[in-house]
Amino acid sequence: SDGGAQDCCLKYSQRKIPAKVVRSYRKQEPSLGCSIPAILFLPRKRSQAELCADPKELWVQQLMQHLDKTPSPQKPAQGCRKDRGASKTGKKGKGSKGCKRTERSQTPKGP
């Protein structure tokens, strides 16, 4: 991490991200200072940009549920700082407002 504050996503990406390349996600919430609700998916490759997605979309909900129930070997993230190399496109600086990281749960919630 480069210690920078997390930016707000201003619009949803038109592309989608394959489930198996996603490491975790975090929620962007308007109540915490960002203009739109969003889910930001963090790719396994830390050099790749986060993908900003609409939480109402079915594919987004599926991927979130998958990540929620999958045990993770990752250590919990420190705060909510962006990974080095994250894209700034379509984002607005908002300090650390609106940033809530959800790493994969350690307890599977599956069947």
């Epitope: 989608k16 991200i17 394959p18 489930a19 109402k56 979309e57 079915l58 909900q61 599926q62 599956g110």
Partner: antibody
Amino acid sequence: EVQLLESGGGLVQPGGSLRLSCAASGFTFNSYSMSWVRQAPGKGLEWVSAISMEGYSKSYADSVKGRFTISRDNSKNTLYLQMNSLRAEDTAVYYCARGYGYYFDVWGQGTLVTVSS
Amino acid sequence: SYELTQPLSVSVALGQTARITCGGDSIGSQYASWYQQKPGQAPVLVIYDDNERPSGIPERFSGSNSGNTATLTISRAQAGDEADYYCSSWDMDAVNVFGGGTKLTVL
């Protein structure tokens, strides 16, 4: 106990319409996506349609696109499938299934739809 | 549209290992699940996320998924395992597909 109970099946003529319902109980309905899956007599499973938790996002199999509409009423814990312009090949047992991530973890017992003149 | 291909039937001797394959273009890049269906009954989930077992499903059931093939393996096959088995996966557009199904016979 987690349960899904389909209803609304029956005999309908080609070109006709039918609305299936699926009553959910035993779980927080609006925390799950839901799907319809069908099975023609003696044939395999065919996914029909899916809907997101609050009903905003929907997807359909090519075979039913433009004819079938999936919807849900979270206040009634009920999933629906409106089927229009029915064809003989739509004859099947229709199952309601609860989605979690990338799989179906709870299934109903199904309701039979027969399209015949 | 995307298709998943399964053998129509697989036979296994009692107590031996059965393997049911599911072929699809780069299915290994997606998550596969498997369902067991006995005559007159609704399907039951036996494997999800390629290789995870739901509670209540015996350890004899396992799964793998790589490249263009997902595989359901049933070790120490029992008479009660006789059923139709279906693989399934979702694409990135939240469209699902099932394989054609495989009838497992335990000899």
